[in-house]
């Protein structure tokens, strides 16, 4: 038997994974556990078998099909269930009724590229991976720009309160090597949470023009 | 096997209300969504709205908010769906149908005749 | 409201006839489309769920495809027992809605 409390969250990527983490404080001795998914009206269901992330926490990917088709809808109910093997038959650990779109984390944005840099700014572009047609334009971003000396943490957030896949870095230093990541999240659902850090991308501002500002 | 069994037909006057029951078997009942759709005479189908028997949770077509109630009776399996202020044009065949892919079960259907 | 265009209204045709209805969502419902069959004063029967998977019982000659907001019901060889109407319906949004019926009539 498992004493302790536990946590269980889940995530929607919009389209067809959902992504789960099981937190314990009672030990569990090699125990096989999953997340198994019954969504309240589709006909199908499906199940992740959960792996250590840390002493007390488990996570797994529910794959629900090819990754950009559109499993769920903001009508559907999932029943999410960690089971445990318990001898024989499998113990319910935790259960939660998951809206997924009230839980959406999106993918981090992918495919960031330099349109143009100058010796000053920069304009970068990005695309959205996997996410639903259901937001339309109902996206916003954050950025962030990692300068030398600094940390990421340190680095000041840029929000865009729009869908759009491009920003243009004013006031940088010339000749100067920098990072840069973006995040998306959707307007919808309570608990909806920013997607991770994309892929940094690092770039080089122009040196300076001897004798002349551009 | 899966079954839905509807109530009897009824007439009524405008003003009155209908009450149209649906007595399901052959499966868990507190686990699918029961659906009502209605056709008026020579007419296409109506969502009206939607129940699911084990949480009560309740889901309507705005169309009709305000003047259909829908209720269940775990013990006996059966929903119920209650439409208010009845007009000539309710006048309608009124299904229940089980929601598991889509609609894949249906009731036999209750004539619903709304005349003064 | 999510509207479900369907064509054509009606359709003559004959036994042995393939035959192709289509059904045009007003917005992007993924694959949340049914297809329903109906006879006079008989309920709807279902046919395809998720735009192209066929219900157990549901003779092989009855076919769906599409996603987004453009779908196809096929019926590969008609039969005598395949003169009804047919239905789309979008389940991908509230309020579910449902074409306006395609008459399938014998020539």
């Known amino acids: 038997a498992v004493n302790g409390t536990s946590q269980f969250t889940c995530f929607y990527n919009s389209r067809a994974n959902i992504s789960c983490v099981w937190s314990q404080d009672g030990a569990l001795q090699d125990t096989s556990c999953q997340v198994h998914a019954w969504p309240d009206r589709r006909r199908w269901n499906q199940t992740c078998e959960l792996l250590p992330v840390s002493q007390a926490s488990w996570a797994c990917n529910l794959i629900l099909g090819a990754p950009d088709s559109q499993k769920l809808t903001t009508v559907d109910i999932v029943t999410l269930r960690v089971l445990c093997r318990e001898g024989v038959r499998w113990r319910v650990m935790a259960i939660q009724d998951f809206k997924p779109f009230e839980n959406l984390r999106l993918m981090a944005p992918i495919s960031l590229q330099v349109v143009h840099v100058e010796t000053h700014r920069c304009n970068i572009s990005w695309e959205i991976s996997q996410a639903s047609h259901y937001f339309e334009r109902h996206l916003e971003f954050e950025a962030r720009t990692l300068s030398p000396g600094h940390t990421w943490e340190e680095a000041p957030l840029l929000t865009l309160k729009q869908k759009q896949e491009w920003i243009c870095l004013e006031t940088l230093t010339p000749d100067t090597q920098y990072e840069f990541q973006v995040r998306v999240k959707p307007l919808q659902g309570e608990f909806t949470t920013w997607s991770p850090w994309s892929q940094p991308l690092a770039f080089r501002t122009k040196p300076a023009a001897l004798g002349k500002d551009t | 096997q899966v079954q839905l069994v509807q109530s009897g037909a009824e007439v009524k006057k405008p003003g009155a209300s209908v009450k149209v029951s649906c007595k399901a078997s052959?499966?868990?009942?507190?686990?699918?969504?029961i659906e009502w759709v209605r056709q008026a005479p020579g007419q296409g189908l109506e969502w009206m709205g939607e129940?699911?028997?084990?949480?009560?949770?309740?889901n309507h077509n705005e169309k009709f908010q305000g003047r259909v109630t829908m209720t269940r009776d775990t013990s006996t399996s059966t929903v119920y769906m209650e439409l208010s202020s009845l007009r000539s044009e309710d006048t309608a065949v009124y299904y229940c149908?089980?929601?598991?892919?889509?609609?894949?079960?249906w009731g036999q259907g209750t004539t619903v005749t709304v005349s003064s | 409201d999510i509207q479900m265009t369907q064509s054509p209204s009606s359709l003559s045709a004959s036994v042995g006839d393939r035959v192709t209805i289509t059904c045009k969502a007003s917005?992007?419902?993924?694959?949340?489309v049914a297809w329903y069959q109906q006879k006079p004063g008989k309920a709807p029967k279902s046919l395809i769920y998720?735009?192209?998977y066929r219900y157990s019982g549901v003779p092989s000659r009855f076919s769906g495809s599409g996603s987004g907001t453009d779908f196809t019901l096929t019926i590969s060889s008609l039969q005598p027992e395949d003169f009804a109407t047919y239905f789309c319906?979008?389940?991908?949004?509230?309020?579910?809605?449902f074409g306006q019926g395609t008459k399938l009539e014998i020539k």
């Open positions: 149908t089980r929601h598991y892919g889509s609609f894949d079960y």
């Open positions: 052959g499966y868990t009942f507190s686990r699918y969504w």
């Open positions: 129940i699911l028997p084990g949480s009560g949770s309740i």
């Open positions: 917005q992007n419902v993924g694959t949340d």
């Open positions: 998720s735009a192209s």
């Open positions: 319906q979008q389940y991908s949004s509230y309020p579910f809605t």
